[in-house]
């Protein structure tokens, strides 16, 4: 599998992974004890036909061209968890692995 | 996990799974011996904020609102394989499970 990595200076218009630091403090999300911020990344860019397609299915839908199918969009194709310490709804402190918090790769699907 | 199912008569505008039969014969993909057609399904519809979001990450990116982030799009969130019989590039007949050929659920990511 393969995905493009970009930064704020990139001129790449195609689907790409960009750096993004999520700052829980800035959001006012005080129930999150740690981390206060983390590198989440995000996906952005155009999905020209076949570029970075994750699934053969994406290609097949393009071929079949059904009503209302909008074509592939740039979305996470590989994600990873982070460990977090936070208060749950019952005000208990929880330490756990939260899935799909970091984008490792972007693709068209 | 939850996803909407629609059909061609549905008036649903939100992200939904629609039926789609992929016909390899109609594509002229004769290297595929079997099946000649299969139910693939596809995703289509709007992703209003928070509706059917697969990852907490999607919500966080929306909050952070970085340059160029287009918002979530309606994309497969659960897929399954099918068994296929086909010729490979060396003209050998291969029987195998091909991943991500059927959309089981759609969501916003």
């Amino acid at each position: 599998d393969f995905g493009l990595d970009c930064d704020e200076h990139s001129t790449e218009s195609r689907c790409c992974r960009y750096p993004l630091t999520v700052d829980f403090e800035a959001f006012g999300w005080d129930w999150i004890i740690a981390p206060k911020r983390y590198k989440a990344n995000y996906c952005s860019g155009e999905c020209e036909f076949v570029f970075l397609q994750k699934y053969p299915h994406t290609h097949l839908v393009h071929q079949a061209n059904p009503r209302g199918s909008a074509g592939p969009c740039c979305t996470p194709t590989k994600m990873s968890p982070i460990n977090m310490l936070y208060f749950n709804g019952k005000e208990q402190i929880i330490y756990g692995k939260i899935p799909a918090m970091v984008v490792d790769r972007c693709g068209c699907s | 996990d939850f996803g909407l199912d629609c059909d061609e008569h549905s008036t649903e505008s939100r992200c939904c799974r629609y039926p789609l039969t992929v016909d390899f014969e109609a594509f002229g993909w004769d290297w595929i011996i079997a099946p000649k057609r299969y139910k693939a399904n596809y995703c289509s519809g709007e992703c209003e904020f928070v509706f059917l979001q697969k990852y907490p990450h999607t919500h966080l990116v929306h909050q952070a609102n970085p340059r160029g982030s287009a918002g979530p799009c309606c994309t497969p969130t659960k897929m399954s394989p099918i068994n296929m019989l086909y010729f490979n590039g060396k003209e050998q007949i291969i029987y195998g499970k091909i991943p991500a050929m059927v959309v089981d659920r759609c969501g916003c990511s």
Epitope: - | F24, E25, G28, D30, W31, I32, I33, A34, P35, K36, I82, N83, M84, L85, F87, E91, I93, Y95
Partner: antibody
Framework: QVQLVQSGAEVKKPGASVKISCKAS????????MHWVRQAPGQGLEWIGN????????NYNQRFKAKATLTVDKSTSTAYMELRSLRSDDTAVYYC?????????????????WGQGTLVTVSS | DIQMTQSPSSLSASVGDRVTITCKAS??????LSWFQQKPGKAPKSLIY???RLVDGVPSKFSGSGSGQDYTLTISSLQPEDFATYYC?????????FGQGTKLEIK
């Protein structure tokens, strides 16, 4: 509808060759295996071999490897079988049949359509 | 090659009878067995595939059963049009091999 129409009866002398045809209609010819089967007078059925028209990949019964050659003409949706070095015991009706997959496993198929048969008579 | 032994080689029966034809493979063929009907001067016609599945358009008086090496074709109530020769075919392994046939005649 799906149809296989074979060429007419042939009479040949021993040592000669013959090429019989099977013209397909009503389906995508290139995407289905074509099989050939023979039946000597008053005898049972024998499998000769098959061919996949898309890429001409073929598979033969060893017994017929030196006897039969399977080819296709995609432009006319026609399968051919050439029989060489004919002998009197090659006198038989030769059938083409389409292999139809009901599933995806390598053996998940049956013959759904047969040609009407071509009688080849080898006589001096 | 897999040998297919069909029995009986001929069979006399009356209209309305129930008849059974058997086919024995020289090894396990994993239910990859088909049955055909052939009338004089005509091409074979597929009846049953995968041991017990009826081909579309074939009347339900025909049924197939069996597994491993042993298979049967049953015709539940013979009609005049059913008198013909019946063949089995194994498609588990190349080369494909047929049984020698069972000729079903009117008694």
């Amino acid at each position: 509808q799906v149809q296989l129409v074979q060429s007419g009866a042939e009479v040949k002398k021993p040592g000669a060759s013959v090429k019989i045809s099977c013209k397909a209609s009503g389906y995508s010819f290139t995407g289905y295996f074509m099989h050939w089967v023979r039946q000597a007078p008053g005898q049972g059925l024998e499998w000769i071999g098959n061919i996949y028209p898309y890429n001409s990949v073929s598979n033969y019964n060893q017994r017929f490897k030196a006897k039969a050659t399977l080819t296709v003409d995609k432009s006319t949706s026609t399968a051919y079988m050439e029989l060489r070095s004919l002998r009197s015991d090659d006198t038989a009706v030769y059938y083409c049949a389409r292999r139809y997959y009901y599933g995806t496993g390598p053996a998940d198929w049956y013959y759904d359509v047969w040609g009407q048969g071509t009688l080849v008579t080898v006589s001096s | 090659d897999i040998q297919m032994t069909q029995s009986p080689s001929s069979l006399s029966a009356s209209v309305g009878d129930r008849v059974t034809i058997t086919c024995k493979a020289s090894q396990d063929i994993n239910s990859y067995l088909s049955w055909f009907q052939q009338k004089p001067g005509k091409a074979p016609k597929s009846l049953i595939y995968r041991a017990n599945r009826l081909v579309d358009g074939v009347p339900s008086k025909f049924s197939g059963s069996g597994s491993g090496q042993d298979y049967t074709l049953t015709i539940s109530s013979l009609q005049p049009e059913d008198f013909a020769t019946y063949y089995c075919l194994q498609s588990d392994e190349f080369p494909l091999t047929f049984g020698q046939g069972t000729k079903l005649e009117i008694k």
